[in-house]
């Protein structure tokens, strides 16, 4: 799996999970989230060469098509696979609210 | 939806469905598929600017992050959303086989 256990230990040009810490205030301009101040969002990036973690029949076909026809612009792309939620604390007026935001943290990637 | 109805009628630099006909023999080097000779596989390509068809909370956050930090390399990518199967005819020896191949045709795209 193209997850932290694999990607953060290997220097990888191909599609892999990349570390990305997002500071809500500095990076997004969001002041409304009280806690946490930021989080490890991560992201997916890298090349998708022939059969590198292709996730569907179409991406495998496209991968082969792109290999045999290197001048073609139709190639798979490195995107998130597994995502996890993030729990945040914010205020409405003086009332604290705890919310779980779904699909905020990328845990693994794929070529699709 | 970033499907044929929208994308094939509009000149679109942003993430959209692109037409791609694949001839099995010419483009993939596959002789084993008897029918059809090829099919409209399509593919997804184009830029993913702020909120352009973002499909998850993470891709929306990444989209905003990328807008506020344009020097960053962390941006969403244009990939397939809905896929459909393709029915093929091939032979094992002299025995004809009909098979439905899942996820062979891209019908719509998203920024992920």
């Amino acid at each position: 799996a193209l997850d932290a256990a694999y990607c953060f230990r290997n220097v990888q040009d191909n599609c892999c999970l990349r570390p990305l810490y997002i500071d809500f205030k500095r990076d997004l301009g969001w002041k409304w989230i009280h806690e946490p101040k930021g989080y490890n969002a991560n992201f997916c990036a890298g090349a998708c060469p022939y059969l590198w973690s292709s996730d569907t029949q179409h991406s495998r076909v496209l991968s082969l098509y792109n290999t045999i026809n290197p001048e073609a612009s139709a190639s798979p792309c490195c995107v998130s696979q597994d995502l996890e939620p993030l729990t945040i604390l914010y205020y409405i007026g003086k009332t604290p609210k705890i919310e779980q935001l779904s699909n905020m943290i990328v845990k693994s990637c794929k070529c699709s | 939806a970033l499907d044929a109805a929208y994308c094939f009628r509009n000149v679109q630099d942003n993430c959209c469905l692109r037409p791609l006909y694949i001839d099995f023999k010419r483009d993939l080097g596959w002789k084993w598929i008897h029918e059809p000779k090829g099919y409209n596989a399509n593919f997804c390509a184009g830029a993913c600017p702020y909120l352009w068809s973002s499909d998850t909370q993470h891709s929306r956050v990444l989209s905003l992050y990328n807008t506020i930090n344009p020097e960053a390399s962390a941006s969403p990518c244009c990939v397939s959303q809905d896929l459909e199967p393709l029915t093929i005819l091939y032979y094992i020896g002299k025995t004809p086989k009909i098979e439905q191949l899942s996820n062979m045709i891209v019908k719509s795209c998203k920024c992920s």
Epitope: L51, R60, I68 | K25, L28, W32, I88, E99
Partner: nanobody, 118 residues
Amino acid sequence: EVQVVESGGAAVQPGESLRLSCAASGSIFNTATMGWFRQAPGKQREMVAIITDGGRTNYADSVKGRFTISRDATKNTVYLQMNSLNPGDTAVYYCNALTIVPRSSIYWGQGTQVTVSS
């Protein structure tokens, strides 16, 4: 059970040749796109060459003109003829089979070691 088995790896000197073989189960061979990949220590696995059932081939830039991939349907075997070997070719070489019938799968062999050193 589908099997992909490589053989032919060895230790050779720079400039020498070697031929790797890969035998695949007959049930998949006729429809499979066969490939050779390699992985050197501390590096990512990379494609070396592929060959389709129709004989279309593609090679990594680093091996073009030196390596030749071929397949023999009568023996369900794919070969990689490697000429003018150099130390940069040292790696574990893996054979794989991409199939989409009877199901979509990528089958990998266990690998065979090729060492090029003087």
